[in-house]
Amino acid sequence: WSSKVLMSSANEDIKADLILTSTAPEHLSAPTLPLPEVQCFVFNIEYMNCTWNSSSEPQATNLTLHYRYKVSDNNTFQECSHYLFSKEITSGCQIQKEDIQLYQTFVVQLQDPQKPQRRAVQKLNLQNLVIPRAPENLTLSNLSESQLELRWKSRHIKERCLQYLVQYRSNRDRSWTELIVNHEPRFSLPSVDELKRYTFRVRSRYNPICGSSQQWSKWSQPVHWGSHTVEENPSLFALEA
């Protein structure tokens, strides 16, 4: 798959119409076969994957993806230069960091090259589609005899752009205690029981200062603190997803 640049008319949305007549829209039939929806996620602001369900096509079809930004010097659609494949059929596009502009409307066009009228144009706010990496380097330290501090790190994304969800529980707890921590990668637990063993984990999302992503990262690797005696009920301590 080669990268191409398509000239775009002033209104790419008109170009995507099937019929350009004065017929009232209620008499216009949509394409017999709708194109699959494109779903994009920006992974840690390092790369973006835009994917579609290629198996929804009744015949194996290599759909093409073109994209541009609403406000850009070069107001042309650019073809994906790195397609993702599922069973040898295009099912997505990976876009590299240098092509990601979080705060401009992302315009993405999916097209059937064998039926050029079969195309769909979607618009996306990329700042709401960021999924951070899981927090790393979780470290625990004693602030006092009974007070613990948990710290962690996030790679490549400014801390002020992230919101964190911290979960912890002891070996005596059936469920996690959780709380939201905004922008500061630290959390202190004022009272811990040294006879219990605690487990902590953290995940993050790009919200609410720099974007409004609802997607949480994966959970960090858990860290433990406290008594290393055998739990009374080890099954309670198993980490659920």
Epitope: E12, D13, A16, D17, L18, P25, L28, A30, P31, P34, L35, E37, V38, Q39, C40, V107, Q109, Q117, R119, A120, V121, Q122, K123, L124, N125, N128, L129
Partner: nanobody, 126 residues
């Protein structure tokens, strides 16, 4: 299947405002991407505004800052508030919908929409 019905069109002087409504019946709009399009006599149908059911809203350059798209899922309706209207805004305005799987899907291509209203005439005079 959803049915859509626009209302609120009319004759207005340049600089004036109108609020178009698009009422849906038959099914909830809560998982529909919605759009507004317009067609002036002898011209191609043109994208005006669209949204996703997740809350993202987008506008054509020609109306950005003047028009506001909103939806009220409780009333099963969408609205297009049009301010600072100009003669070039004169057209039949159509509301359109498409069921979508993803909260972020917003279509600006008219052939992506499966349900259309009958349209409402907006005329802006000098």
């Amino acid at each position: 299947q959803v049915q859509l019905q626009e209302s609120g069109g009319g004759l207005v002087q340049a600089g004036g405002s109108l609020r178009l409504s698009c009422a849906a019946s038959g099914r909830t709009l809560s998982r529909y991407a919605m759009g507004w399009f317009r067609q002036a006599p002898g011209k191609e149908r043109e994208f005006v505004a669209c949204d996703s059911w997740g809350g993202d809203t987008f506008y054509a350059d020609s109306v950005e800052g003047r028009f506001t798209f909103s939806r009220d899922n409780a009333k099963n309706a969408t609205y297009l508030q049009m301010n600072s209207l100009q003669p070039e805004d004169t057209a039949v305005y159509y509301c359109a919908g498409a069921p979508t799987s993803f909260a972020t899907t917003a279509y600006s291509s008219s052939n992506s929409y499966t349900v259309w209203g009958q349209g409402t005439q907006v005329t802006v005079s000098l």
